[in-house]
């Protein structure tokens, strides 16, 4: 039977949402972002072992010729299922702005 | 400058889109899948090195993030920005039928 | 624990300058931008603007354009509202509020307030 | 800027009542929304933001929802100190606006 949230590699091994703190400085937005000075970057990391966490029937398809041509055919990988919105204040040539960014956030993680 | 579709890599190197040719058997469909018996698989294959059609703002963070930990942060990866729809005839309880699968083949590539 | 603590009320006269100032503590000051807030008496919360304690860019509301300065001085955590050509319609409490950690849109904590009274 | 239309402006109730008041934002603003408390003569404290988390500290008793241009504060079981004056801002864009407050009254 299919379980596509147990992770056979062990706990924590399979493509699941992590948790990366990081400064404008380390993501490159020191010249244009002004708040917030550190991010808690949410995003997508870990194994796509056989039918875990599968998003589609591509994700199938790749893995089943991933194991017949691994030199060909990658895994699949993990990626965002879904973003969560973050609100940025930058500079802008006007002056300063607050802006939302959808794609920003990895809300949960899937494979494909 | 960025250019999001020129391959530092070299060409053919970075993500894009391949086909993959492929039987039933090779999918794992032959028990259900009547037609067709052998599909152009489209899928993306590629490396995904800095500003190359990066998919959007996360994808930007987790290429920055990457550089500076690369052991615990993966580059970002290849996948579909969007798909082709395809029809396969299959075997169902009552007979046969005509199933539209909208998540199938890749159409297009982007990193992530 | 994080507190913002600002300067005592003033009366002024109409025509005249007000500096309140809003001293911070309990967290990194520049890290966090700082937002200024006033009510008038039995009224609601106006928002006046917002300083960059980092970078000291500011925005300002654009009823306040040309009246209002906000400063900051880092090596006293102390964030500065500086009200010109006051009116008796600026009587009000001023708060001074700290973008919050989780939304920068939010504000989280606001100073106890300053009662500045125009009168002549 | 965004106008914020917060309703209704005052509202009786009574110790263990579930009190309800909305915000409506003139534009849509994602879930950019904040709650605040104000009690007379003291600050406003921050209850809620990004419309649904609630703040450190804050009872679970208040929660929010919404998203776009409609929201709801909901304070689920009244309690003696929660009667004071309830203030929505939307944090979408520049400047800030605010509701213009409901106040919560001892019935």
């Known amino acids: 039977a299919r379980n596509g949230d147990r992770c056979p590699l062990g706990p924590g091994r399979c493509c699941r949402l992590h948790t990366v703190h990081a400064s404008l400085e380390d993501l490159g937005w020191a010249d244009w972002v002004l708040s917030p000075r550190e991010v808690q970057v949410t995003m997508c990391i870990g194994a796509c072992p056989s039918q875990f966490r599968e998003a589609n029937m591509h994700a199938q398809i790749k893995m089943n010729l991933h194991r017949l041509k691994p030199d060909t055919v990658p895994a699949p990988c993990c990626v965002p299922a879904s973003y969560n919105p973050m609100v940025l204040i930058q500079k802008t040539d006007t002056g300063v702005s607050l802006q939302t960014y959808d794609d920003l956030l990895a809300k949960d993680c899937h494979c494909v | 400058a960025r250019n999001g579709d020129r391959c530092p890599l070299g060409p053919g190197r970075c993500c894009r889109l391949h086909t993959v040719h492929a039987s039933l058997e090779d999918l794992g469909w032959a028990d259900w899948v009547l037609s067709p018996r052998e599909v152009q698989v489209t899928m993306c294959i590629g490396a995904c090195p800095s500003q190359f059609r990066e998919a959007n703002m996360h994808a930007q963070i987790k290429m920055n993030l990457h550089r500076l930990k690369p052991d615990t942060v993966p580059a970002p990866c290849c996948v579909p920005a969007s798909y082709n729809p395809m029809v396969l005839i299959q075997k169902t309880d009552t007979g046969v039928s005509l199933q539209t699968y909208d998540d199938l083949l890749a159409k297009d590539c982007h990193c992530v | 624990q994080v507190q913002l603590v600002q300067s005592g009320a003033e009366v002024k006269k109409p025509g005249a300058t007000v500096k309140v100032s809003c001293k911070a503590s309990?967290?990194?000051?520049?890290?966090?931008?700082m937002s200024w807030v006033r009510q008038a008496p039995g009224q609601g919360l106006e928002w006046m603007g917002y300083?960059?304690?980092?970078?000291?860019?500011?925005v300002y509301a654009q009823k306040l354009q040309g009246r209002v300065t906000m400063t900051t001085d880092t090596s006293t955590s102390t964030a500065y509202m500086e009200l010109r050509s006051l009116r008796s319609d600026d009587t009000a409490v001023y708060y001074c509020?700290?973008?919050?950690?989780?939304?920068?849109?939010?504000?989280?904590?606001w100073g106890q307030g300053t009662l500045v009274t125009v009168s002549s | 800027d965004i106008q914020m239309t917060q309703s209704p402006s005052s509202v009786s109730a009574s110790v263990g009542d579930r009190v309800t008041i909305t915000c409506r934002a003139s534009?849509?603003?994602?879930?950019?929304l904040a709650w605040y408390q104000q009690k007379p003569g003291k600050a406003p404290k921050l209850l809620i933001y990004?419309?649904?988390s609630l703040q450190s500290g804050v009872p679970s008793r208040f929660s929010g929802s919404g998203s776009g241009t409609d929201f709801t504060l909901t304070i689920s079981s009244l309690q003696p100190e929660d009667f004071a004056t309830y203030y929505c801002?939307?944090?979408?864009?520049?400047?800030?606006?605010f509701g213009g407050g409901t106040k919560v009254e001892i019935k």
């Open positions: 509020a700290r973008e919050s950690g989780q939304q920068v849109s939010a504000l989280d904590p």
């Open positions: 309990g967290y990194t000051f520049d890290s966090l931008g």
């Open positions: 300083i960059s304690t980092y970078s000291g860019d500011t």
């Open positions: 534009q849509g603003i994602s879930r950019w």
């Open positions: 990004a419309a649904s």
């Open positions: 801002q939307q944090g979408a864009s520049f400047p800030l606006t």
